[in-house]
Interface confidence: low
């Protein structure tokens, strides 16, 4: 008979996994002993390997929940083409039975005693509830049993008494204005506020409690300005030393507004707190050196190599600059006098080029002469080689940027009969005369 064939057998669950398909014979499915099969969908899964006993199942629940019972477990002979130990055919179940006891004794119900007396009403005025209780001890339950029903019951009760209303304060009223406009007078300024026992008022019959606490409260006024005190100048201090070691400087005298210090918003002292005088050291000031602009880069070379031009071989080149203008022990120029960089030499290298777009129009030349013209150009621009933009020259010193250096020989297809530069000229129109602006104003 045809079977469903699977690619895996899961030992832990005994399930077939990875359906390959149906309609094949057991013999064909089991050409691979790692496969498994089912005779029908959802049926028993049998692995294709040689038969052996499955693991024992877990024990089934105990047959009774209290006192002694028994429970079963099983294992199955699973596999194909052979027998399990004991000459048992695949599919056969083997059972084990053992005694079990979830709980030694079985629960027994108890019985209630009679109801006790009603407790007093839960309130002393208006309506409330009262309660009575009974005990589960007639007889007491055994082995975790219980009594059926409730251990207490409640009913409504009416005291036939009207409840009193107790007094409660309404919110505080606003603070009254302060008794004075500033601090420091003979009487400390105070403010007052009041409240009423009206939220609600206490009842007369039956008598309610009055509101607790005071109907008035007082506090010291805060935030009042003290009386202002005007400030007064102290004496001039000593003249400060000349603050410079060369050239002209400025010395200073100071005085403080502290005779007295202005207080409580009083006005500050009128006039200046400092006065200055010129002082002369008669010593010329040092002049720091300043770097000239960098010189031209030296040719791009590599030590021990005659030429590296037109090759993907990085070299080095340097440029220098001069520190000028240092006088009277001024600072030397900061930084390096020599700049070194890595380079590829494309000096005189024949490179493929491409014509640039037109440049912007240049200035009119000559500016003050006859018939000035302006020009624009298209240049044969070299296409630079795609050499690596960084190199590692010395082990452990990391990557260094490499720059192209030199004037290559770009080669473009001829344009308007030219190989390197095509120029277009135009006359400048409506040209004004050149006049000295100083003379114009006279």
């Amino acid at each position: 008979d045809p079977v469903l064939c699977f690619t895996q057998y899961e030992e832990s669950s005994g399930k077939c996994k990875g359906l390959l398909g149906g309609g094949v014979s057991v013999e064909d499915c089991c050409l691979n002993t790692a496969f498994a099969y089912q005779k029908r969908s959802g049926g028993l899964c049998q692995p294709c390997r040689s038969p052996r006993w499955s693991l024992w199942s877990t024990w089934a629940p105990c047959s009774v929940t209290c006192s002694e019972g028994s429970q079963l477990r099983y294992r199955r002979c699973v596999g194909w083409n052979g027998q399990c130990s004991g000459k048992v055919a695949p599919g056969t179940l083997e059972w084990q039975l053992q005694a079990c006891e979830d709980q030694q004794c079985c629960p027994e119900m108890g019985g209630w005693s009679g109801w006790g007396p009603w407790e007093p009403c839960s309130v002393t005025c208006s309506k409330g509830t009262r309660t009575r209780r009974r005990a589960c001890n007639h007889p007491a339950p055994k082995c975790g049993g219980h009594c059926p029903g409730q251990a207490q019951e409640s009913e409504a009760c009416d005291t036939q008494q009207v409840c009193p209303t107790h007094g409660a304060w309404a919110t505080w009223g606003p603070w009254t204005p302060c008794s004075a406009s500033c601090h420091g007078g003979p009487h400390e300024p105070k403010e007052t506020r009041s409240r009423k026992c009206s939220a609600p008022e206490p009842s007369q019959k039956p008598p309610g409690k009055p509101c607790p606490g005071l109907a008035y409260e007082q506090r010291r006024c805060t935030g009042l300005p003290p009386c202002p005190v005007a400030g007064g100048w102290g004496p001039w201090g000593p003249v400060s030393p000349c603050p410079v070691t060369c050239g002209l400087g400025q010395t200073m005298e100071q005085r403080t507004c502290n005779h007295p210090v202005p207080q409580h918003g009083g006005p500050f002292c009128a006039g200046d707190a400092t006065r200055t005088h010129i002082c002369n050291t008669a010593v010329p000031c040092p002049v720091d050196g300043e770097w000239d602009s960098w010189g031209e880069w030296s040719p791009c070379i590599r030590r021990n190599m005659k030429s590296i031009s037109c090759q993907e071989i990085p070299g080095q080149q340097s440029r220098g600059r001069t520190c000028r203008g240092r006088k009277f022990d001024g600072h030397r120029c900061a930084g390096q006098q020599q700049d070194i960089r890595h380079c590829y030499s494309i000096q005189h290298c024949p490179l493929k080029g491409s014509w640039s777009e037109w440049s912007t129009w240049g200035l009119c030349m000559p500016p003050c002469g006859p018939n000035p013209t302006r020009a624009r150009q298209r240049l044969c621009t070299p296409l630079l080689p795609k050499y690596p933009p960084t190199v590692s020259m010395v082990e452990g010193q990391g990557e260094k940027n490499v720059t192209f250096w030199g004037r290559p020989l770009p080669r473009c297809e001829e344009l308007q009969g030219q190989k390197l530069v095509v120029e277009e000229k135009r006359p400048c129109l409506h040209v004004p005369a050149c006049k000295d602006p100083e003379e114009e104003e006279l």
């Epitope: 037109c310 090759q311 993907e312 071989i313 490179l351 493929k352 080689p385 795609k386 690596p388 190199v391």
Partner: nanobody
């Protein structure tokens, strides 16, 4: 006519190593650049590694840096590609290429820069 012949391909488990060899019919000193390219099924040819002037400069695509090494033996007229820590995504046909040109337009790992090509050798990496 210049000929390049690759060898050393084959099947290997992930994590394993292979060494590809490319034999040239002329002295490889005459080539400025020699390189290895690869092409996986349904993908474009990709530059893997290149060597300039017998190893003065070497270039690698990012995905193989630290795993592949290009080297050459001038006496044997051979260029090699040592491939370590192979991955399933390294599966492809590997080609050897060479050129005498020196000024690049697109870069040393671009196939249109190379004049001479081998027939290729298959490398299969299984997981």
């Amino acid at each position: 006519e210049v000929q390049l012949v690759e060898s050393g391909g084959g099947s290997v488990q992930a994590g394993g190593s292979l060494r590809l060899s490319c034999a040239a019919s002329i002295s490889i000193r005459s080539f400025n650049y020699m390189a290895w390219f690869r092409q996986a099924p349904g993908k474009e040819r990709e530059g893997v590694a290149a060597s300039y002037a017998g190893g003065v400069s070497t270039y690698y695509t990012d995905s193989v840096k630290g795993r592949f090494t290009i080297s050459q033996d001038n006496a044997q007229k051979r260029v090699y590609l040592q491939m370590n820590s192979l991955k399933p995504e390294d599966t492809a046909v590997y080609y050897c290429a060479a050129t005498q040109d020196v000024i690049w337009r697109t870069g040393p790992l671009e196939s249109d820069e190379y004049r001479y090509w081998g027939q290729g050798t298959q490398v299969t990496v299984s997981s």
